[in-house]
Amino acid sequence: EEELQVIQPDKSVLVAAGETATLRCTATSLIPVGPIQWFRGAGPGRELIYNQKEGHFPRVTTVSDLTKRNNMDFSIRIGNITPADAGTYYCVKFRKGSPDDVEFKSGAGTELSVRAKPSAPVVSGPAARATPQHTVSFTCESHGFSPRDITLKWFKNGNELSDFQTNVDPVGESVSYSIHSTAKVVLTREDVHSQVICEVAHVTLQGDPLRGTANLSETIRVPPTLEVTQQPVRAENQVNVTCQVRKFYPQRLQLTWLENGNVSRTETASTVTENKDGTYNWMSWLLVNVSAHRDDVKLTCQVEHDGQPAVSKSHDLKVSAHPKEQGSNTAAENTGSNERNIY
């Protein structure tokens, strides 16, 4: 004997997030009389998606006019699909009953899969800066994508990196997934201008991968090299001593001049020059009045860079090489912001 069949012709439907899903359903008979309902999932915990008879379902529209008595098309459209809508949808015919309608027959179900784009990859580096020759870790995270298949690559200045580990979570079935990857990068002195790039490719991106970047300038610390030199005599009793602070990064630097271990002057690097590789150079000089000294003077340039322990370089100033002038223990004139007289 012929009996109503509920036909869901599509075993599965794949829809991009934000789009509209069409779930097709045909009843092959007008008998028995009774409404159609759509559910997500089966069994007691199933979720009502649409009820032809009653209720408000703002995201659902019917493809055909279900008020028409002769209608056998019970297909629906669900708007603004999100990964949370994924699941198996059942079209169920009910037989008119009293007091309640009775479930008569269900379709085989249509599995709705949602294609969701991954979020823009976020790359984060280490909390503290590291110096060249050290290995640092970068992490890359992207969330909310579906299906699970995804490809992640790391690059440093366009060169692909190979030392990284990637996980996609969760391992089992889920409405959407996240990816987490950690790459190890060896720093070099030339990395101030370098970039680390995390590239994510997914079916939803149509061959146009998403990229997240981190500038190594946020990660690297290049410690300075110091050189203290004595310049030719300006005046008979004055010596100009310079401290060249070279190739440092970042700019945050404090320099202290010590005379025989006593603080003479402290200053902060301001007017620096930038090298092609992004590091900085700075020079401080000290004008020393040697006539004020009976003994040799040990001048020390002490640099504290980016909050690190101070490094220093010393220079011995031979007083005997300069004949003393009587009465010359008065302060000499300051001739520059970086000049200082030693009494």
């Epitope: 045909t26 092959t28 008998i31 493809v63 055909s64 006019d65 028409k68 002769n70 098309d73």
Partner: antibody, heavy 121, light 107 residues
Framework: QVQLQESGPGLVKPSQTLSLTCTVS??????????WEWIRQHPGKGLEWIGY???????YYNPSLKSRVTISVDTSKNQFSLKLSSVTAADTAVYYC?????????????WGQGTLVTVSS | DIQLTQSPSSLSASVGDRVTITCQAS??????LNWYQQKPGKAPKLLIY???NLETGVPSRFSGSGSGTDFTFTISSLQPEDIATYYC?????????FGGGTKVEIK
């Protein structure tokens, strides 16, 4: 008054695809009030229902022909079409397009005049 | 598929006679039944829908009745222009099916 007119070749070779178009005038195919259907009648025989289409694109085909039949709609031209593949002499018939009301009058209240398609080499 | 058995397959009657055609469905189709008239070389024409409702413009001598599995089509007073083949059609179940037809002739 709605009118339906079938058009297409009257002779089709065996194993080829039969293609017919039904042009609707005096009414909109996209109104949502009707199913648009194809019915055929073998010479001297009774009527055989082939299938129908709704303006949304929803279709249902007679299972006896399902593997070979496609009905499509072009709302911009106010037309719907029938394609029947791998034809044999048994597909020789007069092919009718018709309109079936979804409300009020439920039968096929408007028909084309029919077009005879002969399958022969 | 639902089988529709029409009887008789043909009949001959005089002008003015009452003509009755029956259509039996292989199972309950409620009142989802139509009756068509087809004249030679023409397309079928809808006469009765929902087993008993007269289509607009159809003469009142045509009528239909029945529900479930047994249906009757009647021409109360046969007219010469009624010479045609009459078909019942069910639309309760897909695919729709037609009866084999009843050819009506004038004696």
């Amino acid at each position: 008054q709605v009118q339906l007119q079938e058009s297409g070749p009257g002779l089709v070779k065996p194993s080829q695809t039969l293609s017919l178009t039904c042009t609707v005038s005096g009414g909109s195919i996209s109104s949502g009030e009707y199913y648009w259907e194809w019915i055929r009648q073998h010479p001297g025989k009774g009527l055989e229902w082939i299938g129908y289409i709704y303006s949304s694109g929803f279709t249902y085909y007679n299972p006896s022909l399902k593997s070979r039949v496609t009905i499509s709609v072009d709302t911009s031209k106010n037309q719907f079409s029938l394609k029947l593949s791998s034809v044999t002499a048994a597909d020789t018939a007069v092919y009718y397009c018709a309109r079936e009301g979804l409300d009020g009058s439920y039968g096929s209240s408007a028909w084309g005049q029919g077009t005879l398609v002969t399958v022969s080499s | 598929d639902i089988q529709l058995t029409q009887s008789p397959s043909s009949l001959s009657a005089s002008v003015g006679d009452r003509v009755t055609i029956t259509c039996q469905a292989s199972q309950d189709i409620s009142n989802y039944l139509n009756w068509y008239q087809q004249k030679p070389g023409k397309a079928p024409k809808l006469l009765i829908y929902d087993a008993s409702n007269l289509e607009t413009g159809v003469p009142s001598r045509f009528s239909g009745s029945g529900s479930g599995t047994d249906f009757t089509f009647t021409i109360s007073s046969l007219q010469p222009e009624d010479i045609a083949t009459y078909y019942c059609q069910q639309f309760a179940y897909l695919p729709y099916t037609f009866g084999g037809g009843t050819k009506v002739e004038i004696k």
